[in-house]
Amino acid sequence: TPEVWVQVRMEATELSSFTIRCGFLGSGSISLVTVSWGGPNGAGGTTLAVLHPERGIRQWAPARQARWETQSSISLILEGSGASSPCANTTFCCKFASFPEGSWEACGSLPPSSDPGLSAPPTPAPILRAD
């Protein structure tokens, strides 16, 4: 069964800066990755970035830099101020559309005990939805 992992980290240098890393543990070919916050994409969440392996990357504030880390993992740096600033309990979700497995989504947030600059190791998060 494919799995999606999500890792959220607050940067030590800027407390309003977050790094989200997501990966797909499956054998299929990834066709699209959608990163959202505030809940799953299409279920109350707001899209921050869309990454297509061949068409490129699109992102919207407060996303600052989205990129592919490998063929099956991505990272996104968020910077915010005021209303658009993420907070410590913000939920971030990553949805991977792949062939032939379909769509798999998982969410994560900053570990409660995290000091800035620290984060939990990237472990598979609970699968919220498989379309």
Partner: antibody, heavy 114, light 113 residues
Framework: QVQLQQPGAELVKPGTSVKLSCKAS?????SYWINWVKLRPGQGLEW???????????NYNEKFKNKATLTVDTSSSTAYMQLTSLASEDSALYYC???????WGAGTTVTVSS | DIVMTQSPDSLSVSLGERATINCKSS????????????LAWYQQKPGQPPKLLIY???TRESGVPDRFTGSGSGTDFTLTISSLQAEDVAVYYC?????????FGQGTKLEIK
């Protein structure tokens, strides 16, 4: 099928503003971002910006940041681009295009003339 | 901004012959993470909006005839039409799909000789 509908033409006076529309159909409007592109004869295509209807958040090409304002009305599945302080160099064909530029509207010709 | 430069500006080719359009970007369009080139090609016929032909430098959009081929990597890309047809008369644009702002080349006008 996915369609983006734009009015054919707008004739406006120098110094005024115009609000162009792009009505989407055939898909969930809030899941697909809208780009705006300018075409002037002999000058090629220029990307003005994009907006994600799900979050109402735009990105702008710096060149157009003081010229264009992108908005959406999710209730009518329509994207808008307002152009201000119009001058002769704003006379052009303006296209909306969905997502990764894979679906295009037919374009609106804006003519700035007194 | 990434500057996209196409050559030639115009091209006249006989029916059935090969047409080649080049595109050079001022910065690499290669994504190091997944080793993909983010470059697209569009065809624009008179009175019509642009039509996506090629994305990812070499992947044909669904429904595009296989006489259209995209190639290249990094900063140098090529669109080749293997056997020119009358309906291929158009202006062709390359586009940086890599980073904001999404810049286009100045266009290459393709005509029948």
């Amino acid at each position: 099928q996915v369609q983006l509908q734009q009015p054919g033409a707008e004739l406006v006076k120098p110094g005024t503003s115009v609000k162009l529309s792009c009505k989407a159909s055939g898909y969930t409007f809030t899941s697909y971002w809208i780009n705006w592109v300018k075409l002037r004869p002999g000058q090629g295509l220029e990307w003005i910006g994009d907006i994600y209807p799900g979050s109402y958040i735009p990105n702008y090409n710096e060149k157009f940041k003081n010229k264009a304002t992108l908005t959406v009305d999710t209730s009518s599945s329509t994207a808008y681009m307002q152009l201000t302080s119009l001058a002769s160099e704003d006379s052009a064909l303006y296209y909306c295009a969905g997502g990764y530029f894979d679906v295009w509207g037919a374009g609106t010709t804006v003519t700035v003339s007194s | 901004d990434i500057v996209m430069t196409q050559s030639p500006d115009s091209l006249s080719v006989s029916l059935g012959e090969r047409a080649t359009i080049n595109c050079k970007s001022s910065q690499s369009l290669l994504s190091s993470g997944n080793q993909k080139n983010y470059l697209a090609w569009y065809q624009q016929k008179p009175g019509q909006p642009p039509k996506l032909l090629i994305y990812g430098a070499s992947t044909r959009e669904s429904g595009v005839p296989d006489r259209f081929t995209g190639s290249g990597s990094g900063t140098d890309f090529t669109l080749t039409i293997s056997s020119l047809q009358a309906e291929d008369v158009a202006v062709y644009y390359c586009q940086n799909d890599h980073s904001y702002p999404y810049t286009f080349g100045q266009g290459t006008k393709l005509e029948i000789k």
